[in-house]
Amino acid sequence: NKILVKQSPMLVAYDNAVNLSCKYSYNLFSREFRASLHKGLDSAVEVCVVYGNYSQQLQVYSKTGFNCDGKLGNESVTFYLQNLYVNQTDIYFCKIEVMYPPPYLDNEKSNGTIIHVKGKHLCPSPLFPGPSKP
C-alpha cells in the first residue's frame, strides 16, 4: 500500500523563492511522519525535511544549505524555498514516510516538479531610459 503524491509539473521562482505543495492521498492528522523534498533525477540531494508529530510543533530543517520552511495541511505539506540560485533549476521530488501509528507507509515516486529559477536581472528603469537615438 503506497501513498500517492501530486505536485505541479513546473514552477517558476521569479524572486529566487517558490512554494512547492506536495499533496498526498493520505490524511496526516495525528500521524507521525517525515516529509522531504529531494533535488535531481536521482533525488540525490535532500533539500528540506519536515517532521510532523501529533504532540509537538512541526520541525523543519535542511542539512544541505537550503533556506526552507514548511507548512502542514491535512493532506499536504508545502515547502517554501528562498534564496534559490539560477543553477538550482532542476526537478524536485516530494517524499513522505508515515511512521506512527503503524503500519509504516511511504509514497510511490511522483512525477516531480521542475523548478525554474529566474535570476534577478537589472532591467532598465522607465524613469531612466537609455540614451535616445538622434
Epitope: E97, P101, P103, Y104
Partner: antibody, heavy 120, light 111 residues
Framework: EVQLVESGGGLVQPGGSLRLSCAAS??????????VSWIRQAPGKGLEWIGE???????YYSPSLKSRVTISRDNSKNTLYLQLNSLRAEDTAVYYC????????????WGQGTLVTVSS | DIQLTQSPSSLSASVGDRVTITCRAS??????????LHWYQQKPGKAPKLLIY???SLQSGVPSRFSGSGSGTDFTLTISSLQPEDFATYYC?????????FGQGTKVEIK
Amino acid sequence: EVQLVESGGGLVQPGGSLRLSCAASGFSLSTSGVGVSWIRQAPGKGLEWIGEIYHSGSTYYSPSLKSRVTISRDNSKNTLYLQLNSLRAEDTAVYYCARYEYYSYAFDYWGQGTLVTVSS
Amino acid sequence: DIQLTQSPSSLSASVGDRVTITCRASQSVDFHGKSFLHWYQQKPGKAPKLLIYAASSLQSGVPSRFSGSGSGTDFTLTISSLQPEDFATYYCQQSYRSPRTFGQGTKVEIK
C-alpha cells in the same frame, strides 16, 4: 533463517563513545516491510527503546537519547550500527538489536545482546 | 510518552496454574480497530521473545496456552496452564506512538 548478531560491547570510560554493530542475515535491511530497532536493558532493570531505522534509511530516536545517539547502516554488509556519545554510568546495559515488521511493529527477532559497561 | 503499567510486579504460581498478567496504558493504543500492544517473555541472560502481537495474535511457534486479550487501554496476557519453562519475566510493549515503551515487567516465580 533470520538472525541478528550484536558486537562491540565492553568497558568504556565515562565521557567516551561506543559503536555497536548488528549483523543481520536471513533478510535485507533495505527491503521494504521491515525495520530494526536498538533496545537496551540496564542490569536488573526493564527494557528501554533507543531508536530505529527503516528500510529507506530514515531514523527515529527516543527523545531522551536523541542528542547523543546515531543509528546508521551499511547495506553492502547488511549491518546496522549504534553510536552513543558522552557516555555515563547510567548507559551501562545490555544492548539489543531487534527486527520488526511494518504490519504491527512488534519485535519478532532479537539479537543475543552485547554488554556495555561504563566505568573508570 | 505512553506509560504502560503492569500488574502484578511479581507473582508466585505452581505448575498447572492459570496465570493472568494485566497491562494498562496511559492512553489508548488502538488505531483503525487494531491494538498496537505486544507481549514478550524474557528468561535470565537471554533476549526477550515475542509471544503475542497486536493484543491477541499468537506469534508463530508459541504454545497455544499463551493468549492475549484487550483493547484501548486495558490488556491481559493469560497462561492457561503454567509449565516449568514459563517461569520468566513478561513485558508488554506499545508501538502505537514513539517513543515505543515497555511495561516494567512481571516476574513469574515458582511457588
